[in-house]
Every structure is written in C-alpha cells, then in structure tokens.
C-alpha cells in the first residue's frame, strides 16, 4: 500500500489513521472503523468509508450527518461488513439479526429476510445514472463545455478511466451522467464506478474525502455549476429480488438528496 | 533506543478500577500506535485496543469495549488503559507494544485482582 | 474476527534440528502476519514482521513465509535458547489478534 511518503498522510481518504509501520517501513493509513490499510494511489472502496463513516466519534464526524444517505425506504445508514478486499459483502446484516443482499455498492437489493437469508454472489451493479440538476444561471452551459468538464473530472480527480464514463446528457438544468463498467470490462487497478461516484456525490455535497484538497469548484468555461439536487440511480448486472409489492412502486434503486 | 516503560504491579479488589501507564522513549510518540495486550496467568497473548497517541483515535476489542478506556498525554509521551468493574478473570500481566506489528514491548504489568 | 490457528500445540525436537510452525488464518490477509517469541516471564519479542520481513537483531536462523492465509515460521538449526513459545499475530484490520501458541520444547 503506498501513501505520501513525505509526511505519512493519505491524499485520497481523509478518514484514515496513517503511520510509518508498513511493510519494508512505509507509511501505511488504515481506514477508520476496519483498520484495513488503504491504498492511497487510489480511491477507498465505499464500502470501507461507509464503515469509517459509521466508526468516526460523534464528535469527530465531519464529513456526514447521520439522516444522510438514506435509501428511500429509509434503510438509512449502516455499518457494513466488508470482505478482505474492503468490498461490501454479498449478506448484511444489522444486529438485531434482520439481513438482506445488496449490490457493489451497498444498496439494498432484496427483501430483509433473517440470519438465514442466503446470498450467494455480489451482484455488481454496471450502470449508474448520477442525475444533477444545477442552479439557475444566466444561461445554459455549453453542452460539449460541460461534457468535457465532467469528464476531466472523473478522469482527473476521481482516476476513472475515460471508457467508463459512457454519457453526457443535459437538457437545463438537469445534467445526467452514465457511468457504465462491467464486470468484464474492469480490469485490476481499474476504479470502480460505485466508488468514483461515491467521491463525486461526498464531493457535490461539500464532504470530499480527499485530503487537505480544497472542495470541488466545478466551472464551466468560468461560470461556477453549483448542484442543488442529486439523484442516483444503480442498475445491476441481475435484476433485484424484491415482492411484487415492492416492484410495482420502485423500478431502480436510487438514492434522494437535497 | 525505543523503550517503552510500565507502572507498577497493581492488586486491586473485584468492581474496582486500574490504571496503567506506558512511558515511550526513543521515538516521536505521536507518530505510531500503542497497543494494549494482557495475558492470564498460563494463558496466551489477547489484544485490547489500540491508541494513535497523534488524535487519540481508539479502537478496542469488542470484548472490552465498555470497560476499557485508552488515553494518551502527548506532553508526557504517555499512554494509559484503565480497566473498570474488575472482575478476578481480569488478573493477568498487561503489555503495551508499539506499532502495527508490536516492534517494541514494555515489560509488563501485573495486575491482580482478588477479594 | 480473523481468527488464527497455530499448530502443531507443542512441538518436541533437539538442538540442530530445523523446527517448522505454522500459522492459518480464517480469511485472506495478505502478508499482514508478524511472529513472536516469548520465554517464562519474559515479554513476548519480535520476530519476523509482515510473513518474512527480517528483524534488526533477529538471528538469521529465524524465517518466515507465505501469504493469503496460510504461513510459515522456520527455525533452521535450533539453538538452547530457542525452547519457547511461539505466537503469530495479525494486523489486517480490527480487532488484531493472536494465534493460540506453539510450545517449543526439548525433545
């Protein structure tokens, strides 16, 4: 695991404890609530910040607010067990013993069961929709401007590979973004769309994860893009498990914020 | 050198508290983690928690998360554990190590605890 | 909780010989596994950090080996004062924890 050598700190995760006690004496940074060394080249999996998230003092909670977050069936918050490699689990389950199965990116995808609920893969989900609509301004922005904006941002602040962003689309004020990867596509060292957006919606609500970076200031040709509601859509690879009950009012996991 | 030194033997009545100190020397103290380890009599190593002394961010075995309290006074290179509502399973020799691979040990401190 | 096995409980040689302990893990944890030894009222000591990292001050007899889960502590030629007991421990994530113990002993 590398991390800035200078001064032991970890550029890409805020929520990290860093010290020079890694193997051949690196700096190591382990993510709160894991203790899981972190690769600070690249982005922390959202599942590892879910948990330091859940983990950091009442106190020390900087970046979230408990309430934030919620599925729209008000799951809200929880703290995730994550497998060896920081990815969320297949099985959930909260300490009352009520489980469930979820996606790559930790949104529930079926109906909450007991202890003997059975999941038996980690569906990945391999289209995100990041849907934002902006304040109003003196015009509409430039499409292609705004295209390429967003598009240097996932490849330049969050590392996503250009290939993943698969779209664009604007119609004022509302600004969509496709991410598209899918498990065949993703290769090692490869980010993961799930954590790419993770960062950029950290980072659309003024949290950034990134460390002593200032917050994102996203300009368009100058004009500032200030985002006054985000809505994310997770579409998986296999369609979700739910009742019908359940189907007949939500087509797609999403996530509300305002 | 790293040096790591602990308080005295204790003996303390069951539901009473302990603490126990760990002077470091030899290193920049805020910079590594300290661990607490205790081991029974006969018995084997069993880690407590762990403090960065940098932020005093704690973390603590579940098992002993609601009657062990880890502290660090920068001023003094000093780390601390305090133990409450001891019971007489809680006697064993309490170790302090540095960093994540436990580099440097302190030579231990028992504590007993007996009615 | 990574849970780690050592084995064998006891392990009964001579002086010379080459002794082998092992170490398994429940889950994968890279190379995150540091070795100890510790003599009758003495604190345990370091070592071998991250499964075969050498340690300053270590004799060169002391190696160690593997990852993922499954690793390996080896004495080449074993010296009187090596009759101990043997610890492994894990740093992949909290809580860290502790193999049971391998007793070293004189045959």
């Known amino acids: 695991h590398t991390a800035a050598q200078d001064n032991c700190t970890c550029p890409t995760n805020k929520m990290t404890v860093c010290s020079p006690d890694g193997p051949g004496g690196r700096c190591q940074c382990r993510a709160l609530g894991s203790g899981m060394a972190v690769d600070c080249s690249t982005l922390t999996s959202k599942c590892l910040l879910l948990k330091a998230r859940m983990s950091a003092p009442k106190n020390a909670r900087t970046l979230v607010r408990p309430s934030e977050h919620a599925l729209v069936d008000n799951d809200g918050l929880y703290d995730p067990d994550c497998d060896p490699e920081g990815r969320f689990k297949a099985r959930q389950c909260n300490q009352t013993s009520v489980c469930w199965c979820v996606n790559s990116v930790g949104v529930r995808r079926t109906d909450k069961g007991d202890l003997s609920l059975r999941c038996d893969e980690l569906v990945r989900t391999h289209h995100i929709l990041i849907d934002l609509r902006h304040r109003p301004t003196a015009g509409a922005f430039n499409h292609s401007d705004l295209d390429a904006e967003l598009r240097r941002l996932f490849r330049e602040r969050y590392r996503l590979h250009p290939k993943f962003v698969a779209a664009v689309h604007y119609e004022q004020p509302t600004i969509q973004i496709e991410l598209r990867q899918n498990t065949s596509q993703k290769a090692a060292g490869d980010v993961d769309i799930g954590d790419a957006a993770y960062y950029f919606e950290r980072d659309i609500k003024g949290e950034s994860l990134f460390q002593g970076r200032g917050g994102l200031d996203l300009r368009v040709r100058g004009e500032p893009l200030q985002v006054e509601r985000t809505l994310i859509y997770y579409l998986d690879e296999i369609p979700p498990k739910f009742s019908m009950k359940r189907l007949t009012h939500h087509h797609h996991h999403h996530h509300h914020h305002h | 050198q790293v040096q790591l030194v602990q308080s005295g033997a204790e003996v303390k009545k069951p539901g009473a508290s302990v603490k126990v100190s760990c002077k470091a020397s030899?290193?920049?103290?805020?910079?590594?983690?300290i661990h607490w380890v205790r081991q029974a009599p006969g018995q084997g190593l069993e880690w407590i928690g762990t403090i960065f002394p940098s932020n005093a961010y704690a973390v603590y075995n579940q098992k002993f998360r609601d009657r062990a309290t880890m502290t660090a006074d920068r001023s003094i290179s000093t780390a601390y554990i305090e133990l409450s509502r001891l019971r007489s399973d809680d006697t064993a020799v309490y170790y302090c190590?540095?960093?994540?691979?436990?580099?440097?040990w302190g030579q231990g401190t028992t504590v007993t605890v007996s009615s | 909780e990574i849970v780690l096995t050592q084995s064998p409980a006891t392990l009964s040689l001579s002086p010379g010989e080459r002794a082998t302990l092992s170490c398994r893990a429940s889950q994968n944890i890279g190379t995150s596994i540091h070795w100890f030894q510790q003599k009758p009222g003495g604190s345990p000591r370091l070592l071998i950090k991250y499964a075969s990292e050498s340690i300053s001050g270590i004799p060169s007899r002391f190696s160690g080996s593997g990852s993922g889960t499954d690793f390996t502590l080896t004495i080449s030629s074993l010296e009187p004062e090596d009759f101990a007991v043997y610890y492994c421990?894990?740093?992949?994530?909290?809580?860290?924890?502790f193999g049971q113990g391998t007793k070293l002993e004189i045959k």
């Open positions: 190590a540095r960093a994540s691979y436990f580099d440097y």
């Open positions: 421990q894990h740093s992949h994530s909290w809580p860290f924890t």
């Open positions: 030899g290193y920049t103290f805020t910079t590594h983690w």
